[in-house]
């Protein structure tokens, strides 16, 4: 995998160490924390990004409560186990031998257990709902302009094909972006919706993962779109398995 050739950096992931030790002296970048080689032409997987984040100084964050079958990430601040492809392993455990099962975006989908807990497969998150509230503007944004701009953003910045942006809903000041992607729909080179959503979330929080690129500057027909709050809901192909105790 190569990176920006001239200065040997990774445009899509600043949490990397790059050096010209690839084949033929080409630039190669490895993710912090895991040391895994990453492809700098596309998004790095969320699992490797979380691992890199945990190897760097970290800030405490508040949690958001999930509702119904939709899971809300508690900002995912744990040191995950990733497979050789950089995906989350279905079972995650902490240093005190507490284990739980996660979905493909690394969000816990079962009660916590011990080392005997079994997670048979990594359950795919096939539907992500990004719920945004924008700051007050002179007037409402034009819905079709907003839709087009967000599709363009997800393609150009996050490399997500517009086919995976299922819908953009807008009722001022709330914008909802629906991402849908079944395993079978992904073709060679297609970005995962979970990775795109994570990069977007970090951009919205002013914590861009891109190297040397400016922060997110979202404009709809020249009018700045400034986000006040974000909630991301994750829907899995198989509903999560939590005990009734957790739901009360």
């Amino acid at each position: 995998h190569t990176a920006a050739q001239d200065n040997c950096t990774c445009p899509t992931n600043k949490m990397t160490v790059c050096s010209p030790d690839g084949p033929g002296g080409r630039c190669q970048c490895r993710a912090l924390g895991s040391g895994m080689a990453v492809d700098c032409s596309t998004l790095t997987s969320k699992c490797l990004l979380l691992k890199a984040r945990m190897s760097a100084p970290k800030n405490a964050r508040t949690l958001v409560r999930p509702s119904e079958h939709a899971l809300v990430d508690n900002d995912g601040l744990y040191d995950p186990d990733c497979d050789p492809e950089g995906r989350f392993k279905a079972r995650q455990c902490n240093q005190t031998s507490v284990c739980w099962c996660v979905n493909s975006v690394g969000v816990r989908r079962t009660d916590k257990g011990d080392l005997s807990l079994r997670c048979d497969e990594l359950v795919r998150t096939h539907h992500i709902l990004i719920d945004l509230r924008h700051r007050p503007t002179a007037g409402a944004f034009n819905h079709s302009d907003l839709d087009a701009e967000l599709r363009r953003l997800f393609r150009e910045r996050y490399r997500l094909h517009p086919k995976f942006v299922a819908a953009v809903h807008y009722e001022q000041p709330t914008i909802q972006i629906e991402l849908r992607q079944n395993t079978s729909q992904k073709a060679a080179g297609d970005v995962d919706i979970g990775d795109a959503a994570y990069y977007f979330e970090r951009d919205i929080k002013g914590e861009s993962l891109f190297q040397g690129r400016g922060g997110l500057d979202l404009r709809v027909r020249g009018e700045p779109l400034q986000v006040e709050r974000t909630l991301i809901y994750y829907l899995d192909e198989i509903p999560p398995k939590f005990s009734m105790k957790r739901l009360t």
Epitope: S41, A187, D190
Partner: antibody
Framework: QVQLVQSGAEVKKPGASVKVSCKAS????????MHWVRQAPGQGLEWMGE????????SYNQKFKGRVTITRDTSTSTAYMELSSLRSEDTAVYYC????????????WGQGTLVTVSS | DIQMTQSPSSLSASVGDRVTITCRAS??????LNWYQQKPGKAPKLLIY???RLESGVPSRFSGSGSGTDFTLTISSLQPEDFATYFC??????????FGQGTKLEIK
């Protein structure tokens, strides 16, 4: 080895339709995007549209204003491109090409199908 | 749509020469630029993708560089089989994906 084999040359009258086929082999048909590109005699390349064989999703070059339809048959690993309301300027070689989702590079191409539109 | 402009449109060179073809995009396309070679009566062949990555089986005398709007294809030492037409193509934004008009490389 990866191969894309297209149907033979066609001669059509203005106003008619043409349907070109592209049979894929040597790889998993549903795992790659398939694109259609045309080239008028002595001219450059023009992207027409794309399909994901897994679910049949398509997107098209708006230049063709609804005249182009791309379909696929996963049972035979074949993609099709139909162009309707043909005019003389549609005379071209039509290519199918396998595409990559991120780079949108076309790494394997069919041999091309010459479509001649003439009255 | 993003316009891709190649220069020169044609070029005469000799075997052993170093040749450079440029491609300019009408807006920033990051590094999502691909190069193809086409010989008469044949389908195009992918040479380079993502600005500088050599497609498998392509000789190392071909190289690509650039970023943003300006890109270059270089052939370090022309071989007889390199005389052909070369096209650049962007895959950055929403469809349609667009090609340059082509550069015809001829024997001097």
């Amino acid at each position: 080895q990866v191969q894309l084999v297209q149907s033979g040359a066609e001669v059509k009258k203005p106003g008619a339709s043409v349907k070109v086929s592209c049979k894929a082999s040597g790889y998993t048909f549903t795992s790659y995007w398939m694109h259609w590109v045309r080239q008028a005699p002595g001219q450059g390349l023009e992207w027409m549209g794309e399909i994901t064989p897994s679910d049949g999703y398509t997107s098209y070059n708006q230049k063709f204003k609804g005249r182009v339809t791309i379909t696929r048959d996963t049972s035979t690993s074949t993609a099709y491109m139909e162009l309707s309301s043909l005019r003389s300027e549609d005379t071209a070689v039509y290519y199918c090409a396998r595409g990559h989702g991120n780079y949108v590079s076309f790494d394997y191409w069919g041999q091309g199908t010459l479509v001649t539109v003439s009255s | 749509d993003i316009q891709m402009t190649q220069s020169p449109s044609s070029l005469s060179a000799s075997v052993g020469d170093r040749v450079t073809i440029t491609c300019r995009a009408s807006q920033d396309i990051s590094n999502y630029l691909n190069w193809y070679q086409q010989k008469p009566g044949k389908a195009p062949k992918l040479l380079i993708y993502y600005t500088s990555r050599l497609e498998s089986g392509v000789p190392s005398r071909f190289s690509g560089s650039g970023s943003g709007t300006d890109f270059t294809l270089t052939i370090s030492s022309l071989q007889p089989e390199d005389f052909a037409t070369y096209f650049c193509q962007q895959g950055y934004t929403l469809p349609p994906y667009t090609f340059g008009q082509g550069t015809k490389l001829e024997i001097k």
